[in-house]
């Protein structure tokens, strides 16, 4: 049975086997087409989600679809039901928490009272002044909190206590990519991890350990990517994996936060990378122990210079490394998180591509997660 499962796929009605390599090849080899059912699926970027959270204390903003303007949500008459609606609009199913925060002196958006209409937040028509003088600070999920704060600068062995959202994404029990837990059902990784194998069956996720072989595997229900854009072949290197059964969080299995829509990180901002990738460029061996390293944001202009990536780094990507080189993510770390710590840890980037490993002028290039929030929310909403 093990041999059969490894090399063949069973079609139904009539029952017969086809070679597993015919799964997800674009041809209907089973009469009912089930060989093309459980495959990596693409999902369009979709419409603008009409709510978002700002890095200013996670304050809620609502879109007026008529004018295309964004407004800050006033705390007046804001309820748990409205908080739940806002989070559902972003695709969350967990119980949110919210609080009032004072309107700051730098408040540049108009502040409006919020109401609900057909399960979407709306601005109250006759919205007067914000009497409470407070905005809504909203958290849809308790995320980005680990048991231990990393202290080391440079490259160091990591503990799952520091990075409980890190997962190993495996095909046929072999580590292929890293990934990050975003909520009980969803793992974030890179689309290029699935180029070779587009059938969902043999992909598994392993969570809850810093050692590669030592933790149980979790079945995957769906793998979703964005439609390929031939104009920008390296763009859209992002994928979401939906787990068959929701994770139960613990000390070693917890979600990382998504970035805020306005999370603009300036050059030299400290960031962290983790992974089980190769310890040397062009070979070496995969590390059995999770490794962590501190890096920093590298200016896109510098990254696109003639002695670097010569314009290949787009608006939807970011560069990180250390100016003198030597610290970088490498093969096998693809799909893992590039992380920033404000109050919570946020996944601001996904390990995507680069030339070599750790060169001074060619740092790692990462998918900029904030550029894909809308897509993530639309995928989640479609799957709620």
């Amino acid at each position: 049975k093990v041999i059969l499962d490894k090399y063949y796929f069973l079609c139904g009605q009539p029952l017969h086997f086809i070679p597993r390599k015919q799964l997800c090849d674009g041809e209907l080899d089973c009469p009912l087409g089930e060989d093309e059912e459980h495959c990596v699926k693409s999902f369009p970027e979709g419409p603008a989600v009409a709510v978002r959270l700002s890095k200013d204390r996670s304050t809620l903003q609502v879109l007026d679809s008529a004018t295309g303007n964004w407004f800050s949500a006033c705390f007046d008459n804001f309820t748990e039901a409205l908080a739940e609606t806002a989070c559902r609009q972003m695709g969350y199913s967990s119980k949110p928490t919210f609080r009032a925060v004072e309107i700051g002196p730098d408040q540049d958006l108009d502040v409006v009272e919020i109401t609900e209409n057909s399960q979407e937040l709306r601005m109250r028509n006759s919205s007067g002044p914000c009497l409470s003088g407070s905005l809504v600070s909203l958290h849809c999920l308790a995320c980005g909190k680990s048991l231990k704060t990393p202290r080391v600068v440079g490259v160091e062995e990591a503990s799952v206590d520091s990075w409980p959202w890190q997962v190993s994404i495996q095909y046929d029990k072999q580590h292929v990519c890293g990934g990050s837990i975003l909520d009980p059902h969803w793992v974030l990784t890179a689309a290029h991890c699935f180029r070779k194998h587009t059938d969902v069956f043999n992909w598994k996720v392993r969570a809850g350990s810093d050692k590669l072989g030592s933790f149980p595997s979790l079945a995957v229900a769906k793998i979703i990517i964005i439609e390929f854009n031939p104009m920008y072949p390296k763009d859209n290197d992002i994928a979401l994996m939906k787990l068959q059964f929701p994770l139960t969080f613990s000390g070693t299995v917890r979600p990382i936060c998504l970035p805020f829509f306005d999370e603009e990180l300036t050059p030299a901002t400290p960031l962290w990378i983790i992974g089980w990738g190769f310890t040397k460029q062009n070979g070496g061996k995969m590390s059995d122990i999770l490794l962590q390293a501190s890096v920093q944001v590298i200016d896109s202009t510098r990254c696109n210079a003639d002695d670097a990536y010569q314009g290949e780094v787009t608006e939807k990507m970011m560069c990180a490394g250390i100016p003198e080189g030597g610290v970088d993510t490498c093969q096998g770390d693809s799909g893992g998180p590039l992380m920033y710590q404000s109050d919570q840890w946020h996944v601001v980037g996904i390990v995507s591509w680069g030339y070599g490993c750790g060169g001074p002028s060619t740092p790692g290039v990462y998918t900029k997660v904030s550029a894909y929030l809308n897509w993530i929310y639309n995928v989640w909403k479609a799957e709620l």
Epitope: R99, V101, A142, C143, K145, S146, L147, K148, T149, D161, G208, T248, F249, S250, G251, T252, V253, R254, P255, D343
Partner: antibody, heavy 119, light 107 residues
């Protein structure tokens, strides 16, 4: 509603061990960590350790490492704290407390169990 | 481990007055700070977590502020049921640690 019900008061001799239980109800037991916190008479609160029933992972305070063992039985939704090599200064009320939502603060507490260590 | 220090040890306040309790961490705990209230013979009760978020069912007269190493719990107008001992707890990293407590008593 969430409830944590602890076992009754204990009197123990120095050098012996005590095992206190904490039965949880009103929520999914494996979904939250259970910590143990103690309070000596007239003193403040002291965290001893935590168990995550989802994977039975435990973490202990260095002050109690080697002397405390926290376990959980998912079938009965019960957590246990065993403290060994008891001395008179372990006389305290021992509380179990539920960790809330992966953020390590305690939203529900047991009623407390008084452990008296006396020869 | 992170040491939490509360001040004052005792605060004497008249009913209806404002009470301000302080808590200092020996190193940054970001916003991972909780406040608990404990009355004699009872288990502690969660008031505030994440430095400023009120727990379910906690009256609006309780508010928390601060981040990093300096935190404050404010009770805007003390009611008779608020006279108790208040503890801060950092929930930023293990081992979790508590302050030694501030007793709020009737003046």
């Amino acid at each position: 509603q969430v409830q944590l019900v602890q076992s009754g008061a204990e009197v123990k001799k120095p050098g012996s061990s005590v095992k206190v239980s904490c039965k949880a109800s009103g929520y999914t037991f494996r979904g939250s960590g259970i910590s143990w916190v103690r309070q000596a008479p007239g003193q403040g609160l002291e965290w001893m350790g935590i168990i995550y029933p989802a994977d039975s992972e435990t973490r202990y305070s260095p002050s109690f490492q080697g002397r405390v063992t926290i376990t959980a039985d998912e079938s009965t939704s019960t957590a246990y704290m065993e403290l060994s090599s008891l001395r008179s200064e372990d006389t305290a009320v021992y509380y179990c407390a539920r960790e809330s939502s992966s953020w390590d603060y305690f939203d529900y507490w047991g009623q407390g169990t008084l452990v008296t260590v006396s020869s | 481990e992170i040491v939490m220090t509360q001040s004052p040890a005792t605060l004497s306040v008249s009913p209806g007055e404002r009470a301000t309790l302080s808590c200092r961490a020996s190193q940054s705990v970001r916003s991972y700070l909780a406040w608990y209230q404990q009355k004699p013979g009872q288990a502690p009760r969660l008031l505030i977590y994440g430095a400023s978020t009120r727990a379910t069912g906690i009256p609006a007269r309780f508010s928390g502020s601060g981040s990093g190493t300096e935190f404050t719990l404010t009770i805007s107008s003390l009611q008779s049921e608020d006279f108790a001992v208040y503890y801060c707890q950092q929930h930023g990293s293990l081992p979790l640690t508590f302050g030694q407590g501030t007793k709020v008593e009737i003046k």
